[in-house]
Interface confidence: medium
């Protein structure tokens, strides 16, 4: 008898549920006390009839949707609901991050391509300078310039290349050609074996003056910033990809099942979860993911700081597109000192007896109109610069992305408005009260199931990567004044700072980029080198600070190759029809 009453109650409850959220209406005559509605819904999840009871059953084997009376759910149905709930959650998460993911992927691709275009232009400008001013150098010069800019591209993309070595190699290669083709055009072939000697003399005698050092400063600073910028964007994609594909725990699956599906077991097909209840469940399910929030915020703000400083010598467009001019100036420097150099090199490389040295005449003016170049360059720079700022503004709108995720997902899945007449995981209530819900479930599996186990290993890993990139981004924070107020030509040549002896300097050209604020830079990565000595016979001076070895960890040169982006084919499967 009692069973019949409970069955009748269940049927009445099913019928009542059809009226939400409208006005209460008198119930129609009760149909057969069956699980027909539940069955027809469940068949959308799982074809076949075998799992759904025909009529309500005691449900003593249920573990999640614990019944207060007869139920239309079986253990197998419960398992299917759990699986579906976790899939729904993953799809909701992917749809939540789709816009952000697309924003970063698109921009990473755009900037990578833009930087490659800048490198290509810079190479063309430099080749044009050689062609128009030093045609006799062109075959070899084109080759050396090509190699240099290939290395620049590779460096930007994360290759383990030393910028100072690139610059040294360029000038080491150029000087023998300049010497044999320009300074001594009639040098016999037998003298070509002096190339190695000339390469050495290039550094020992500082034949290009301080120009190689200037180029090292500019190129290393600008390329490091560019590289870290791309690295940061790619890590952003990795962060989103990681959280996008999180697998939710079984505990979370149980909570989601209780929230989205347990009402069906009681025949309440149209009931929606209470908003407050949804938030509590989502916060529990996403506790690990939300831990990313702090580091994600820092990531966006650090990236903004980096972008704000990407100008002058920290802007690769500015530096690379003006490189042809500096190289031209460096060759002119050689020409001005040709007389003295040829005598010294004659002795040094033991060819002074073979011939009379003479200096050739060289054109002083660049065929390329620097003013035109400059104008075109500024426009290009502005385009990229504004694009960077635009990206940052858009990213800042996602600064609370992770902390807002639980709320976002609840607002994008069916929940009852105003928390009235809603499902609290156990029963239909007029108004949701977290306390009441907790008390009513004392002996049930409840929110305490979601013990704070700490974030998933993949989340911990991505947090570590974010910490690392944030540290790098802070490292790259550009000096705020002293250096940027100086003329570009002065960069790296501040008197008394780093050019007076053989010691390495940590800041002669300003607060350099590889310096980690309040971070040790100890000897760990001797990424660059600096020889500073006032005696001739020492190696070419390289850029202070950017190429030092230091007692403090040089995090600015940590090379993590940029990952190729996986194609973004996200199919967001709408599951509202499943839970509505």
């Amino acid at each position: 008898m009692a069973g019949t009453v409970r069955t009748a109650c269940l049927v009445v409850a099913m019928l009542l549920s059809l009226d939400f959220p409208g006005q209460a209406q008198p119930p129609p005559p009760p149909p057969d006390a069956t699980c027909h509605q539940v069955r027809s819904f469940f068949q959308r999840l799982q074809p076949g009839l075998k799992w759904v009871p025909e009529t309500p059953v005691p449900g003593s084997d249920l573990q999640v949707c614990l019944p207060k009376g007869p139920t239309c759910c079986s253990r197998k149905m419960e398992e299917k609901y759990q699986l579906t709930a976790r899939l729904n959650m993953e799809q909701l998460l992917q749809s939540a991050s789709m816009e952000l993911k697309f924003l970063i992927i698109q921009n990473a691709a755009v900037f990578q391509e833009a930087f490659e275009i800048v490198v290509r232009h810079a190479k063309n400008y430099t080749n044009a300078m050689f062609k128009n001013n030093y045609p006799s150098l062109t075959p070899q010069a084109f080759e050396f310039v090509g190699e240099f800019f290939t290395d620049v591209s590779l460096y930007i993309l994360g290759s383990d290349i030393n910028v100072d070595d690139m610059v040294n190699e360029l000038f080491d290669s150029l000087f023998p050609v300049i010497y044999t083709q320009l300074m001594n055009p009639g040098l016999p072939d037998s003298a070509l074996d002096i190339n190695e000697c000339l390469r050495g003399a290039r550094r020992d005698l500082k034949v290009f003056g301080n120009f190689p050092k200037l180029i090292m400063t500019q190129v290393s600073k600008s390329l490091q910033v560019t590289r870290i910028f791309l690295q940061a964007l790619n890590l952003g994609i990795e962060v989103i990809n990681t959280t996008d594909h999180l697998k939710f725990s079984k505990d979370c699956g149980r909570m989601l099942t209780r929230m989205w599906y347990c009402s069906y077991c009681q025949g309440l097909m149209m009931v929606k979860p209470c908003g407050g209840y949804c938030n509590v469940v989502m916060q529990g399910c996403m506790a690990g993911v939300v831990e990313i929030d702090k580091y994600w915020r820092e990531y966006i703000l650090s990236l903004e700081e980096l972008v704000n400083g990407m100008y002058r010598i920290y802007d690769m467009e500015n530096v690379l597109l003006g490189l042809f001019s500096t190289i031209h100036d460096s060759i002119q420097y050689v020409q001005k000192n040709a007389g003295k150099l040829t005598t010294t090199i004659g002795k040094l490389c033991a060819h002074s007896q073979q011939r009379q040295y003479r200096s050739a005449y060289y054109p002083e003016d660049l065929f390329i109109d620097k003013k035109v170049l400059k104008v075109a360059h500024v426009e290009h720079e502005e385009t990229l610069s504004s694009r960077r700022r635009e990206l940052i503004q858009k990213l800042k709108s996602f600064i609370s992305f992770y902390s807002a995720l639980p709320g976002y997902i609840c607002s994008h899945s069916p929940v009852a408005e105003n928390d009235t007449l809603c499902w609290n995981g156990q029963e239909l209530v007029e108004r949701y009260s977290q306390k009441a819900a907790r008390n009513g479930m004392k002996n049930q599996f409840n929110l305490h199931e979601l013990k704070m186990k700490g974030p998933e290993p993949v989340v911990s890993q991505i947090i570590d990567k974010l910490k690392h990139i944030n540290q790098l981004l802070r490292t790259m924070s550009m000096p705020k004044g002293r250096v940027l107020d100086k003329n570009l030509d002065e960069e790296g040549f501040e008197s008394g700072d780093c050019g007076d002896d053989e010691d390495e300097c940590i800041g002669g050209s300003g607060d350099g980029m590889i310096k980690v604020k309040n971070q040790l830079r100890f000897l760990a990565e001797l990424a660059y080198d600096l020889d500073v000595d006032d005696a001739p016979g020492n190696s070419q001076q390289a850029t202070p600070k950017d190429n030092e070895i230091s007692t403090f960890h040089n995090l600015g040169n940590v090379h993590s190759p940029l990952k190729l982006l996986t194609s973004m084919a996200i199919s967001v499967v709408c599951f509202f029809f499943l839970v509505h």
Epitope: D165, G496, D501, I506, L523, A527, Y528, D531, S550, F552
Partner: antibody, heavy 115, light 112 residues
Framework: QVQLVQSGAEVKKPGASVKVSCKAS????????MHWVRQAPGQGLEWMGA????????AYSQKFQGRVTLTADKSISTAYMELSRLRSDDTVVYYC????????WGQGTLVTVSS | DVVMTQSPLSLPVTLGQPASISCRSS???????????LHWYQQRPGQSPRLLIY???QRPSGVPDRFSGSGSGTDFTLKISRVEAEDVGVYYC?????????FGSGTKLEIK
């Protein structure tokens, strides 16, 4: 020219602390790391730690970790080395020296630890 | 830590004669950037150390050209082409390429 001038000799009791100063001149103090090296009488050189005056960042030898503190006052271009919980075997000469090849050294400060 | 082993511990030399001091490191001091972070110091009696050679073979200004450094990897040599009276003292090799910087135990050069 570059000069590093250290404070004078000190006599300390075991368990006490000593603070040695190193005043730099002739270059931009914040542009170079300052390292501290010590030398027991008739013995070799032993690296103690390093300081980046610009940021205040420090690195210490494991042997002295917890006992040595390196600081700097940029306004007067002076680096300091403080060694605490002195023992008799800390009776040595302490040098400040400019990184990285240690081309410039202070004149040394003899610290005698004796009860 | 990188262990620096110097030999000989004592080196008696006749004035005007050459002298050679050897230094061996427990691991290579050649960095991937191609430079060797090995330096030589001279310490005259009662004085602070003085840099003689840096990066294996580079001579700072003011150091007489009778001092030269050579070697690579783990084996290094300091040569004095003609010993003079002022060269008396202890010579140390040291490396600054790996954490922490370390020094050899020293070679005492004396006049025979």
């Amino acid at each position: 020219q570059v000069q590093l001038v250290q404070s004078g000799a000190e006599v300390k009791k075991p368990g006490a602390s000593v603070k040695v100063s190193c005043k730099a001149s002739g270059y931009d103090f914040t542009a170079y790391e300052m390292h501290w090296v010590r030398q027991a009488p008739g013995q070799g050189l032993e690296w103690m730690g390093a300081l980046d005056p610009k940021s205040g960042s420090t690195a210490y030898s494991q042997k002295f970790q917890g006992r040595v503190t390196l600081t700097a006052d940029k306004s007067i271009s002076t680096a300091y080395m403080e060694l605490s919980r002195l023992r008799s075997d800390d009776t040595v000469v302490y040098y400040c020296t400019r990184f990285y090849s240690y081309a410039h050294w202070g004149q040394g400060t003899l610290v005698t630890v004796s009860s | 830590d990188v262990v620096m082993t110097q030999s000989p511990l004592s080196l008696p030399v006749t004035l005007g004669q050459p002298a050679s001091i050897s230094c061996r490191s427990s691991q290579s001091l050649v960095h991937s950037n191609g430079y060797t972070y090995l330096h030589w110091y001279q310490q005259r009696p009662g004085q602070s150390p003085r840099l003689l050679i840096y990066k294996g073979s580079q001579r700072p200004s003011g150091v007489p050209d009778r001092f030269s450094g050579s070697g690579s990897g783990t084996d290094f040599t300091l040569k004095i082409s003609r010993v003079e009276a002022e060269d008396v003292g202890v010579y140390y090799c040291g490396q600054s390429g790996l954490t922490p910087p370390t020094f050899g135990s020293g070679t005492k050069l004396e006049i025979k």
